[in-house]
């Protein structure tokens, strides 16, 4: 808390500006008007505050807005949002998407802070869902914004925000993840063309189900291995070797390679050895000749 | 090309004046305060001095005030110091550092090259 | 606000994990920022707002720390590394430096 003290004779500030640079702390709780702060918020940013002043002008800000600052203040607050807590931003009710960026603009550079967290949130909350520029705002700064979502979260994405995301923005996404945003991806692409269609469904398939892989592996698509190792184990496991091989097409090599790794391992078990040898890849871990494979779970299923 | 290029340094006896020159580039110099930081050799760096981007604040270490002057020339993209009084502990090498700008930033994320001040009789 | 760095010096061999301290007389939130300079030569931003790595600086100097105790670690010391390098801190006036920490060959 900063003691009161009356401001020394004239000092007083009739404007934020440089002036007040150098002011020591208890100068600038004297003589700078909150009211006067709010409405010039904008100069703030260009003028060199050190944090110890900064923290002096949220102070006098908290005191004039005990119930949290309006949007006019919050736009312009610029590089003072760095010093305010979650908790402050809490109170706030952030409309405007020009605020939002502003403010992320400021936090550019570092990581996702809680501070930025909350703020997010706070905006997507209020807006009911997460609307196409709103995404496109968030992983422009954020790229794995997305990807930092609960599948819940993101259940609430509608299918026409998904142009926004770019393969970057999935790196970080899991597979529980994927299975919400898959669907809203084949439904927000089903009008493509086939090649076309793949290069923007490509990012999203670790949550695709067997038959969409099936279907696909009829269209040439050439599936480098990087995707193929991304997607669901147990949607891979029922292909077939043909298919896999229409699948990854001249990509079929890198299996070799990959042979020791999931999916590829797990597919490799349920596969027959002469099956592999046709790709002539030297896979080895297949069902041996002669025997017999019985799928369990099918029977289960009839019984 | 952005940078900061000082002048004006060399050998003065105690007692003596000196004025430094930094002459800035590439960037929008009156958008900016600017500072003068110092190394004696062999030593650390210690911070000297500081102006505003119109040159209307100025802030001085205690062990310069009264001694020096800062000043600025946006017309002319310069940075000035003026050192009167100079003493042997003054000898350093001079830096005209930029500040990174508004908000708290103030670190110095431009660097001159340094002019060496050394005072002696 | 004094800033007190350790080591004053050490030596390390390439490739070695480098991390230097500085600590604030009194918190300074994350009003923190590294240089490295090299004889001869002037200061460089490496870090800001104690965490922060300044465009162009490579991803093995990093900067943790808040309040009073902050660190500069070089995951894999390179032989361009050698030198010296000192925090700053902006909380508030007057801007004080650290007194340096030298990394010299092993």
């Known amino acids: 808390e900063v003691e009161k003290t009356a401001c020394p004779s004239g000092k007083k500030a009739r404007e934020i500006d440089e002036s007040l640079i150098f002011y020591k702390k208890w100068e600038l709780e004297a003589c700078v008007d909150a009211a006067l702060l709010a409405t010039q918020m904008d100069r703030v940013n260009a003028i060199p505050f050190t944090y110890e002043q900064l923290d002096v002008l949220k102070h006098k800000l908290d005191e004039l807005y005990p119930q949290g600052y309006p949007e006019s203040v919050i736009q312009h607050l610029g590089y003072l949002f760095l010093k305010m807590s979650p908790e402050d931003i809490r109170k706030w009710n952030v409309t405007s998407l020009e605020t939002l960026k502003a403010l992320l603009e400021v936090n550019k550079g570092h990581e996702m802070s809680p501070q930025v967290a909350t703020l997010i949130d706070r905006f997507v909350k209020g807006r009911g869902q997460l609307d196409k520029d709103t995404l496109d705002t968030l992983t422009a700064f954020y790229p794995g914004y997305l990807c930092s979502l609960s599948p819940e979260e993101l259940s609430s994405v509608p299918p026409s925000s998904i142009w926004a995301v770019r393969p970057q923005d999935l790196d970080t996404c899991d597979p529980r993840q994927l299975d919400v945003l898959y669907p809203k991806a084949r439904l927000a692409f089903q009008n493509m063309n086939g090649s076309e269609y793949f290069v923007k469904i490509q990012s999203f398939l670790g949550g695709a189900p067997t038959e969409d892989l099936k279907a696909l592996s009829q269209q040439n698509v050439s599936m480098d291995l990087a995707t193929f190792m991304k997607l669901r184990t147990d949607a891979v496991l029922p292909l077939t070797v043909a298919e896999v091989q229409k699948l990854l097409g001249p990509h079929v090599e890198g299996l070799k390679a990959e042979e020791r790794h999931r999916p590829v391992r797990d597919w490799i078990l349920r596969q027959r050895q002469d099956d592999l040898d046709t790709l002539g890849l030297g896979l080895q871990g297949g069902i041996p000749n002669g025997y017999l494979v019985l799928d369990l779970s099918m029977q289960e299923a009839l019984s | 090309e952005v940078q900061l290029l000082e002048s004006g340094g060399g050998l003065v006896q105690p007692g003596g004046s000196l004025r430094l020159s930094c002459a800035a580039s590439?960037?929008?110099?009156?958008?900016?305060?600017m500072s003068w930081v110092r190394q004696a050799p062999g030593k650390g760096l210690e911070w000297v001095s500081a102006?505003?981007?119109?040159?209307?604040?100025?802030y001085y270490a205690d062990s310069v005030k009264g001694r020096f002057t800062i000043s600025r020339d946006n017309s002319k993209n310069t940075l000035y110091l003026q050192m009167n009084s100079l003493r042997a502990e003054d000898t350093a090498v001079y830096y005209c550092?930029?500040?990174?700008?508004?908000?708290?930033?103030?670190?110095?994320?431009?660097w001159g090259r340094g002019t060496l001040v050394t005072v002696s009789s | 606000i004094q800033l007190t760095q350790s080591p004053s010096s050490l030596s390390a061999s390439v490739g070695d994990r480098v991390t230097i301290t500085c600590r604030a007389s009194?918190?300074?939130?994350?009003?923190l920022a590294w240089y490295q300079q090299k004889p001869g030569k002037a200061p460089k931003l490496l870090i800001y707002?104690?965490?922060s790595l300044e465009s162009g600086v490579p991803s093995r100097f990093s900067g943790s720390g808040s309040g009073t105790d902050f660190t500069l670690t070089i995951s894999s010391l390179q032989p361009e590394d050698f030198a010296t390098y000192y925090c700053?801190?902006?909380?508030?006036?007057?801007?004080?430096f650290g007194g340096g920490t030298k990394v010299e060959i092993k």
């Open positions: 550092a930029k500040w990174m700008g508004g908000g708290g930033r103030l670190y110095f994320d431009l």
């Open positions: 590439g960037f929008t110099f009156s958008s900016y305060a």
């Open positions: 102006i505003s981007g119109s040159g209307g604040s100025t």
């Open positions: 009194q918190g300074i939130s994350s009003a």
């Open positions: 707002d104690a965490s």
């Open positions: 700053q801190q902006f909380n508030n006036y007057p801007l004080t």
